[in-house]
Amino acid sequence: AMHVAQPAVVLANSRGTASFVCEYASPGKATEVRVTVLRQADSQVTEVCAATYMMGNELTFLDDSICTGTSSGNQVNLTIQGLRAMDTGLYICKVELMYPPPYYMGIGNGTQIYVIDPEPCPDSD
């Protein structure tokens, strides 16, 4: 299995955006890579977003995705937007080397993202 590293903890900003780097130790010379972000909460794992990209090119997530990202070498900088307190959880980075063979897959230990909803501004007279 391929080794995937990601930070243990990240705090989302006041606008509900969190960014973290997902780095993989590529044993092959992949030209096409797939990155998937999974969220684990209460032993349930759900897919947050996924993108396939060609080495040296931008990551392209679906138009309605809450994720954006950039790649550089064996690093992917992932940004998740629109997070709320209820979205606090463990976000796992899964990397697959899709082409050419051999196929490799690696899963990180996860990044615990903490999201704190901003306090509403008090009404001013």
Epitope: E32, E96, P101, P102
Partner: antibody, heavy 120, light 112 residues
Framework: EVQLLESGGGLVQPGGSLRLSCAAS????????MSWVRQAPGKGLEWVSG????????HYADSVKGRFTISRDNSKNTLYLQMNSLRAEDTAVYYC?????????????WGQGTLVTVSS | QSVLTQPPSASGTPGQRVTISCTGS?????????VHWYQQLPGTAPKLLIY???KRPSGVPDRFSGSKSGTSASLAISGLRSEDEADYYC???????????FGGGTKLTVLG
């Protein structure tokens, strides 16, 4: 159900052209590399061409380089093989094949094949 | 001439153990690429039998096993049955050809 369905085979004269199609269903087509593999009558399997999930990377066997073109339309979940300057030795059953398990790169899904006959 | 070399035929009686070899080179099996084995019954499309040298897809009986060493690999079938009569192909990615290469195939005959 995961499925591949080839079409477009038939009888063609030497020097002629054919376009094969492979319709995929039951898996995330755009994520996975696809290949064409052929089998001449009474002979073994021969890999013809492969294309990455995005279509950005393509490889051909030397025997078809410059004559065959592989392509894919991810919006239609379809793989194509444009075959030009066909020769008698291209006569074969053509299979499209892929791996969609996310466990390995072996071809665990095959179509039923489409027969291409090159003869005058 | 296939890039991977297999014996053209093999045979055995029911219950016996049969081994099929697959020899490659430093640009495919010897380069560390995994070997996959396919079974093709008469008149049907190939079916994945063994992947990543020695792993079985679900539904494949444990009578089938694979191994790899250096530039060669082998498929072993124990407790041979009449329904095992088929063509068997090994395959691996080839670094220098930038493509998949297959063995020429081995026709397995179950005698008696």
């Amino acid at each position: 159900e995961v499925q591949l369905l080839e079409s477009g085979g038939g009888l063609v004269q030497p020097g002629g052209s054919l376009r094969l199609s492979c319709a995929a269903s039951g898996f995330t087509f755009s994520s996975y590399a696809m290949s064409w593999v052929r089998q001449a009558p009474g002979k073994g399997l021969e890999w013809v061409s492969g294309i990455s999930g995005s279509g950005g990377y393509i490889h051909y066997a030397d025997s078809v380089k410059g004559r065959f073109t592989i392509s894919r339309d991810n919006s239609k979940n379809t793989l194509y093989l444009q075959m030009n300057s066909l020769r008698a030795e291209d006569t074969a059953v053509y299979y499209c094949a892929t791996y969609s398990s996310g466990l390995h790169d072996a071809f665990d899904i095959w179509g039923q094949g489409t027969l291409v006959t090159v003869s005058s | 001439q296939s890039v991977l070399t297999q014996p053209p035929s093999a045979s055995g009686t029911p219950g016996q153990r049969v081994t099929i070899s697959c020899t490659g080179s430093s640009s495919n099996i010897g380069a560390g690429y995994d070997v996959h084995w396919y079974q093709q019954l008469p008149g049907t499309a190939p079916k994945l039998l063994i992947y990543d040298n020695n792993k079985r897809p679900s539904g494949v009986p444990d009578r089938f096993s694979g191994s790899k060493s250096g530039t060669s690999a082998s498929l072993a079938i124990s407790g041979l049955r009449s329904e095992d009569e088929a063509d068997y192909y090994c395959a691996a990615w080839d670094d220098s050809l930038n493509g998949w290469v297959f063995g020429g195939g081995t026709k397995l005959t179950v005698l008696g």
